[in-house]
């Protein structure tokens, strides 16, 4: 048994790190596979995470941990029964990649506007909370020429369209994803999308 | 009540052996990290070892090394120290102290924060 | 290793006067934000250790309000408001961030 490519981790900087590997042939993960990781820290004890299998040669594994700080490393050993098949460390301060933002919703009945709400994924405590901008990805399944990503640059999970920039009686869906700057974040993955329908109609007199 | 009872104490020539023992109570063992503290005559306090909850990783002063033994059996809710090669500069009093929850990701901390009451090792030809 | 200063070593206080004591150490117990690892125990005559303030400035459950820590990275202080007589005796900072463990040197306070 043979590891084709080492484990790759990633933290939500909150209480998760997910690590993602490929073995050199089809592997049953959960059964044969175990991820142990260990805080380099005073009296820690070692943790086990039961891989799963992420595609017919993949593994993914959810390593639970405490809030994560800055001077946290771990210690990575994969096993195989009593095989050691890779021993690596892992920083999870310096290989974030936050959650995806929640509860995207269409406000359509504003005036002249389209208001996009989501919710921030963190809590206020959490270092991420202020920390994070967006990206709303907006298209049209009706036009698939249409697709537009807007970036929010400031604190406020809000985005408000001019509905007049969106076509008339057609359906639009939207995405939201973030990332944190002063973390060196990548982006998180993208929130489910919700649709609307867009029934805004100039005034007649601008027609 | 949480209470940490130490034993196990007594004279022994150098070269010889002891075995102190620490017993735990009011507290749930093998939750947590335990540590051995020694004070010589009339000296401040020196750390010597420590072990985590569930004894897998184990920590010694210099002073001790490749000499002395920590271990626990969480199963009797006991610490103990096996002293071998014993030194006329191992005269103290040993204490045994709760320390570190252990069983979190990070283990958390609350000081020292239960001492037992002491057990007096002599060193002496 | 992380060596442990105390200073002074002996201090005589008259009783409902403040006392303070300092403890420095050779290089950084801060693991993160508030989580200063540094301890300050008490010894009284003929007694084992107690806990006073743990992570720097946290006071020990039972521990009398007088008693206050502070301080972060290399530098922290212990600070008694008001002494009381019962509060003579030998009081130790450690640092418990890495093994091995130090202790300070120890400074004797003493009812004047």
């Known amino acids: 048994m043979k590891v084709l490519q080492e484990p790759a981790c990633v933290s939500d900087y909150m209480s998760i790190s997910t690590c993602e590997w490929k073995m050199g042939g089809p592997t049953n993960c959960s059964a044969e596979l175990r991820l142990l990781y260990q805080l380099v820290f005073q009296s820690s004890e070692t943790h086990t995470c039961v891989p799963e299998n992420n595609g017919g040669v993949g593994c993914v594994c959810h390593l639970l941990m405490d809030d994560v700080v800055s001077m946290d490393n771990y210690t990575l050993d994969l096993w195989a029964g009593q095989q050691l098949l890779w021993k690596g460390s892992f920083k999870p301060s310096e290989h974030v990649k936050p959650r995806a933002p929640g509860n995207l919703t269409v406000h359509t009945n504003v005036s002249d506007t389209v208001l996009l709400t989501w919710s921030n994924p963190y809590p206020p405590d959490n270092y991420l909370y202020n920390d994070l901008t967006y990206a709303v990805n907006i298209w049209s399944e009706n036009d698939p020429a249409y697709s537009r990503i807007h970036n929010v640059t400031y604190l406020k999970p809000t985005l408000r369209i001019p509905a007049s920039t969106l076509k008339s009686g057609i359906s639009y869906r939207a995405r939201v994803r973030a990332w944190a700057q002063h973390y060196n974040t990548t982006w998180s993955e993208w929130s489910p999308s919700t649709k609307w329908y867009n029934s805004y109609r100039e005034p007649f007199e601008q027609r | 009540e949480v209470q940490l009872v130490e034993s196990g104490g007594g004279l022994e020539q150098p070269g010889g052996s002891l075995r102190l023992s620490c017993a735990g109570s009011?507290?749930?063992?093998?939750?947590?990290?335990m540590t051995w503290v020694r004070q010589a005559p009339g000296k401040g306090l020196e750390w010597v070892s420590s072990?985590?909850?569930?004894?897998?990783?184990?920590y010694y002063a210099d002073s001790v090394k490749g000499r002395f033994t920590i271990s626990r059996d969480n199963s009797k809710n006991t610490l103990y120290l096996q002293m071998n090669s014993l030194r006329a500069e191992d005269t103290a009093v040993y204490y045994c102290a709760k320390d570190r929850l252990s069983v979190t990701v990070r283990p958390r901390y609350y000081g020292l924060d239960v001492w037992g009451q002491g057990t007096t090792v002599t060193v002496s030809s | 290793d992380i060596v442990m200063t105390q200073s002074p070593l002996s201090l005589p206080v008259t009783p409902g006067e403040p006392a303070s004591i300092s403890c420095r150490s050779s290089?950084?117990?801060?693991?993160?934000?508030?989580?200063?690892?540094v301890d300050w125990y008490l010894q009284k005559s003929g007694q084992s250790p107690q806990l006073l303030i743990y992570?720097?400035?946290k006071r020990a459950s039972g521990v009398p309000d007088r008693f206050s820590g502070s301080g972060s990275g290399t530098d922290f202080t212990l600070k008694i408001s008001r002494v009381e007589a019962e509060d003579v005796g030998f009081y130790y900072c450690m640092q418990s961030l890495t093994s091995p463990y130090t202790f300070g040197q120890g400074t004797k306070l003493e009812i004047k």
């Open positions: 009011g507290f749930t063992f093998r939750d947590f990290a």
């Open positions: 992570l720097g400035n």
């Open positions: 290089q950084s117990v801060l693991y993160s934000i508030g989580y200063n690892y």
């Open positions: 072990i985590s909850g569930s004894g897998s990783s184990t």
